[in-house]
């Protein structure tokens, strides 16, 4: 959470003189309340909006728009507060509008514009502005607060912003998963051009559960340069295990941009529908792919076992 | 060379909490996850639960749920199991053990009393 | 939850014979099972795993076999450092459970 870094912050208008100053969240009004103080603003607009920095990165930014009630009190309104709370982190940024002239009532509805809060993908933000001075204690409320919920990087929008794009949002992997004979599953999908490795975590769970039953990672070398775009084949061998049926594949990039941080993808196979007449279930099914000449576990993740090439 | 080595013995008074660590080494952490089990003086092998190293994914026994957490701190490989509401059949020797469902490596125990 | 039981409780053998430990399962768990020895003062010790793959470092004298419900290990020619308490685990369902134990006594 922070300002739009070279923007001069302009809050002026035809009739008014203003000017944008950073703020404490904490006005003066709170420690010294004043006798007569405005209305609250009568409705906040938020928008998305992308904007660019000076070093050309394309950011989210939040778009806040409001208006002013047609009463009396606009002639006590000394400016505005606005503050942005990021709601997973508490972090508050705060902005203050002081207007350098007093307002009057003119044809058209007053209406207020901001649009230099970046914001991060995925990310709920809550805005509030607060008409100054503050009211005194007990005085009815002078401020307005909304949420709002940043898309994520899937947002065709938000795609092209750099965080999108340093966490890897233009990698589309078209992930496909298929049941195959011998509860083994094959994962398909494309790599990126970038010379990385990726891990996929196949975590199974019991139908209509949500506590996982078995857990396997698997790590795939990075690709050569002849193998970018092409689609990698992974087969897993699931574990037999009572009714551990439903599969979430997820796969983990490590892109130099965004390292551990990357985004993941991720695709589901449900339980089977319950035939009528159940299939017979093989009732051995090998712990890992034995080692020739070894009894060793083998050294990957959780009881599994895996093979994988790629496709031209 | 893999070794869990796990906390040193507590004692505690009933209705207090008690958080066993167990520092894992000579193996990528994150590639395999963590069981808790226990083992009342005298008394057989009881598995209290699992926790994934790489998704924080966890699975606990029905009788300990609610009373039970187990994290894990991926920066120093340490897992960590949590328990709530101590009563005196808790007493036991806690272990963590390497992986999910068979576990091929052990930490050396702790030895948890629970006395007023 | 699938309750797993050992037989006999303890059993007395001489340095030198064989040695057969029971494992019953309440129903049936494929292959999932496991075999631990534990000597007092000291954490269980992986032998058998998929109920007949030795662990690593495990002598062969050990070896489990079965499926289903019913298991055995058996120590071909018992040593002195075997006697010890054996246990069985199930691996098949949650949650995951262990046998009551066989004390493995010299005679």
């Known amino acids: 959470l922070r300002l739009l870094d070279h923007r001069a912050l302009v809050c002026s208008q035809p009739g008014l003189n203003c000017t944008v100053k950073n703020s404490t969240c904490l006005d003066d009004s709170w420690i010294h309340p004043r006798n007569l103080t405005p209305s609250s603003p009568k409705n906040i607009y938020i928008n998305l909006s992308v904007s660019s920095t000076q070093h050309g990165e394309l950011v989210p930014v939040l778009h806040v728009e409001w208006t002013l009630q047609t009463d009396a009190s606009i002639l006590y309104l000394e400016g505005a507060e606005l503050s942005v709370l990021q709601l997973n982190t508490n972090e508050r940024l705060c902005v203050r509008f002081e207007f350098l002239s007093k307002l009057r009532h003119h044809h058209r509805r007053w209406r207020f514009t901001f649009s230099h809060f970046v914001v991060d993908p995925d990310q709920e933000y809550e805005v509030t502005v607060h008409h100054l001075p503050k009211p005194i204690p007990d005085g009815d409320p002078n401020h307005q607060s909304k949420n709002f919920l940043v898309p994520d990087c899937e947002h065709a929008r938000m795609k092209v912003t750099t965080p999108c794009m340093s966490s890897g949002s233009l990698w589309d992997p078209n992930i496909t998963v298929e049941t195959l004979e011998a509860h083994q599953l094959r994962v398909s999908f494309t790599l990126w051009n970038e010379s990385t490795h990726y891990q996929i975590l196949l975590t199974s769970f019991p139908h209509m559960e949500n506590h996982s039953c078995f857990e396997h990672m698997h790590h795939i070398p990075a690709p050569r340069p002849e193998e970018f775009h092409q689609r990698s084949n992974v087969t897993l061998t699931l574990r037999n295990l009572k009714g551990c049926c439903r599969h979430q594949v997820q796969i983990q990039p490590f892109f130099s941009s965004c390292l551990n941080d990357c985004l993941r993808h991720s695709a589901t196979v449900s339980c089977p529908e319950m035939p009528d007449t159940p299939e017979p279930i093989p009732d051995y099914m090998p712990l890992w792919e034995p080692r020739s000449g070894s009894s060793d576990y083998k050294d990957d993740d959780d009881k599994g076992s895996s093979h994988h090439h790629h496709h031209h | 060379q893999v070794q869990l080595v796990q906390s040193g013995a507590e004692v505690k008074k009933p209705g207090a909490s008690v958080k066993v660590s167990c520092k894992a080494s000579?193996?990528?952490?994150?590639?395999?996850?963590i069981s808790w089990v226990r083992q009342a003086p005298g008394q057989g092998l009881e598995w209290m639960g699992w926790i994934s190293t790489y998704s924080g994914n966890t699975n606990y026994a029905q009788k300990l749920q609610g009373r039970v957490t187990m994290t894990t701190d991926t920066s120093t490989s340490t897992a960590y199991m949590e328990l709530r509401s101590l009563r005196s059949d808790d007493t036991a020797v806690y272990y963590c053990a390497r992986r999910q469902l068979y576990f091929d490596y052990w930490g050396q125990g702790t030895l948890v009393t629970v006395s007023s | 939850e699938i309750v797993m039981t050992q037989s006999p409780a303890t059993l007395s053998v001489s340095p030198g014979e064989r040695a057969t430990l029971s494992c019953r399962a309440s129903?049936?768990?494929?292959?999932?099972l496991a075999w631990f020895q534990q000597k007092p003062g000291q954490a269980p010790r992986p032998l058998i795993y998929?109920?007949?793959t030795r662990a690593t470092g495990v002598p062969a004298r050990f070896s489990g076999s079965g499926s289903g419900t019913d298991f055995t290990l058996t120590i071909s020619s018992l040593q002195s450092e075997d006697f010890a308490v054996y246990y069985c685990?199930?691996?098949?369902?949650?949650?995951?459970?262990f046998g009551g134990g066989t004390k493995v006594e010299i005679k």
């Open positions: 129903q049936s768990v494929s292959s999932n």
């Open positions: 998929d109920a007949s």
């Open positions: 685990q199930q691996y098949d369902n949650w949650p995951l459970t």
């Open positions: 000579g193996y990528t952490f994150t590639r395999y996850g």
